[in-house]
Interface confidence: low
């Protein structure tokens, strides 16, 4: 801790500029104004002053806003927000996204780090909801961001802000998050027609429901293997061979090289041998002739 | 030199409203903190809120939430009180501050 | 909210002797950046109050050094040595750690 100490005379910083960087801590303790610093800290990223110096002017600006940093302040504080902490950051209210951005781009290039995520968390609460500029912004600096949200947060995405996820997004999230995504997709690109409508759904599937798969093996719209291995496997092994076959198209041959891979190799024991053998694929694992299909989400209810 | 200038005093009757205002001098309007205190006559000081005139954000004491409404305007740097319900207990002095600046007062009274 | 105490309503002083004004906070005043925050502030007669301490021990400008705080957490000191006839008023602390800021009643310094 920098001791408060008289300003030795002629000190007197009259305004924050390159000069600072000679002086010691407790000189730019005894002689920077607090209020002085607050008003200028746009100049501060300018200088380059060592990790102590900065300490001293985050205790600076700690004294004179210990409740948390106005608006103004937080949009300029440049590498010193690197010195905040989540318990620092808490304190905010950070309502402009020109602010956001101004702080992501502080930390661009890193992992996002505990203050990044609380002036998130911060931000997103402030707004009520993951607006669509909002979600721009945030997958721009961290394609991960939508993907690190509880199933929770995400419910609060409202259907309008889907057009901003770009497929790169949603690579890291798993079935619990898509199920929450994928309804809102479903909304918010209901009124394209059948191939753009797919393309745009592609990438949400992992949530879809055995009845959309289901309708969408009536369009014609070649599913990759990819995406198809990404898809429930409780929406999958309802699905006939025949849907199967019309959802993947000419895709449809990649099925032998995933055959012992989920939700292949499930959908494979659901399946008629027999119909199997219609893909021409020598797909094995299926029910033979004369064997009774039984329900076996059922079964695994009684047992 | 930061100066804070308050308005005048003012004599209003029970139920009335009553805006205050204090206008800063010195100092980058949006880069403060506009905190509001009152103090009754012969009485100890307490903090009714205050306002970030960046974003217009507020804060109130409990006991003020329902009765002050606090407002800023860059354009002029100026905060202001808004009092509603008013009655003799809110008759004080309204000191509008910015942490070691404090304004005159403004002393309210109200009386029919 | 945290609950500010100051014990003594009032402290008599002989001029040029020295006197300790008390306060006590129900929680502790110490962030999480290692500074407490406890503002000691001195109303005299007919004035405004005005900033003499800040995070506890932090001479505000233009303050005398024969004013200086101390304490730690929960209980806090302000010590004048050499009391002046100027020094005549009523001290306040506050917390400024937390909303609401709260007050301390007051101690009122008199000359005997």
């Known amino acids: 801790e920098v001791e408060k100490t008289a300003c030795p005379s002629g000190k007197k910083a009259p305004e924050i500029d390159e000069s600072l960087i000679f002086y010691k801590k407790w000189e730019l303790e005894a002689c920077v104004d607090a209020a002085l610093l607050a008003t200028q800290m746009d100049r501060v990223n300018a200088i380059p002053f060592t990790y102590e110096q900065l300490d001293v002017l985050k205790h600076k600006l700690d004294e004179l806003y210990p409740q948390g940093y106005p608006e103004s302040v937080i949009q300029h504080l440049g590498y010193l927000f690197l010195k905040m902490s989540p318990e620092d950051i808490r304190k905010w209210n950070v309502t402009s996204l020109e602010t956001l951005k101004a702080l992501l781009e502080v930390n661009k290039g890193h992992e996002m780090s505990p203050q990044v995520a609380t002036l998130i968390d911060r931000f997103v609460k402030g707004r009520g909801q993951l607006d669509k500029d909002t979600l721009d912004t945030l997958t721009a600096f961290y394609p991960g961001y939508l993907c690190s949200l509880s199933p929770e947060e995400l419910s609060s995405v409202p259907p309008s802000s889907i057009w901003a996820v770009r497929p790169q997004d949603l690579d890291t999230c798993d079935p619990r998050q898509l199920d929450v995504l994928y309804p809102k997709a479903r909304l918010a690109f209901q009124n394209m027609n059948g191939s753009e409508y797919f393309v745009k759904i592609q990438s949400f599937l992992g949530g879809a429901p055995t009845e959309d798969l289901k309708a969408l093996s009536q369009q014609n719209v070649s599913m990759d293997l990819a995406t198809f291995m990404k898809l429930r496997t409780d929406a999958v092994l309802p699905l006939t061979v025949a849907e199967v076959q019309k959802l993947l198209g000419p895709h449809v041959e990649g099925l032998k090289a995933e055959e012992r891979h989920r939700p292949v190799r499930d959908w494979i024991l659901r399946q008629r041998q027999d119909d199997l053998d219609t893909l021409g694929l020598g797909l094995q694992g299926g029910i033979p002739n004369g064997y009774l299909v039984l329900d076996l989400s059922m079964q695994e209810a009684l047992s | 030199e930061v100066q804070l200038q308050q308005s005048g005093a003012d004599l209003v009757k029970p139920g009335a409203s009553v805006k205050l205002s204090c206008t800063v001098f010195?100092?980058?309007?949006?880069?403060?903190?506009m905190h509001w205190v009152r103090q009754r006559p012969e009485q100890g000081l307490e903090w009714i809120g205050r306002i970030d005139p960046a974003n217009d954000n507020s804060i109130y004491g409990p006991k003020f939430q329902d009765k002050a409404t606090i407002t800023a305007d860059t354009s002029s740097n100026t905060a202001y009180l808004h009092l509603s319900s008013l009655t003799s207990e809110d008759t004080a002095v309204y000191y509008c501050l910015y942490f070691d600046n404090w304004g005159h007062g403004t002393t309210l009274t109200v009386s029919s | 909210d945290i609950v500010m105490t100051q014990a003594a309503s009032s402290e008599p002083v002989t001029p040029g002797e020295s006197v300790s004004i008390s306060c006590r906070s129900d929680?502790?005043?110490?962030?999480?950046?290692?500074?407490?925050?406890l503002y000691w502030f001195l109303q005299r007669p007919g004035q405004s109050p005005h900033l003499l301490i800040y995070r506890m021990s932090n001479l505000a400008s233009g303050v005398p050094d024969r004013f200086s705080g101390s304490g730690s957490g929960t209980a806090f000191t302000l010590r004048i040595s050499r009391v002046e006839a100027e020094d005549v008023g009523v001290y306040y602390c506050m917390q400024h750690l937390e909303y609401p800021l709260t007050f301390g009643a007051g101690t009122k310094l008199e000359l005997k």
């Open positions: 010195g100092l980058n309007f949006k880069d403060t903190f």
């Open positions: 929680k502790s005043l110490l962030h999480s950046n290692g500074h407490n925050y």
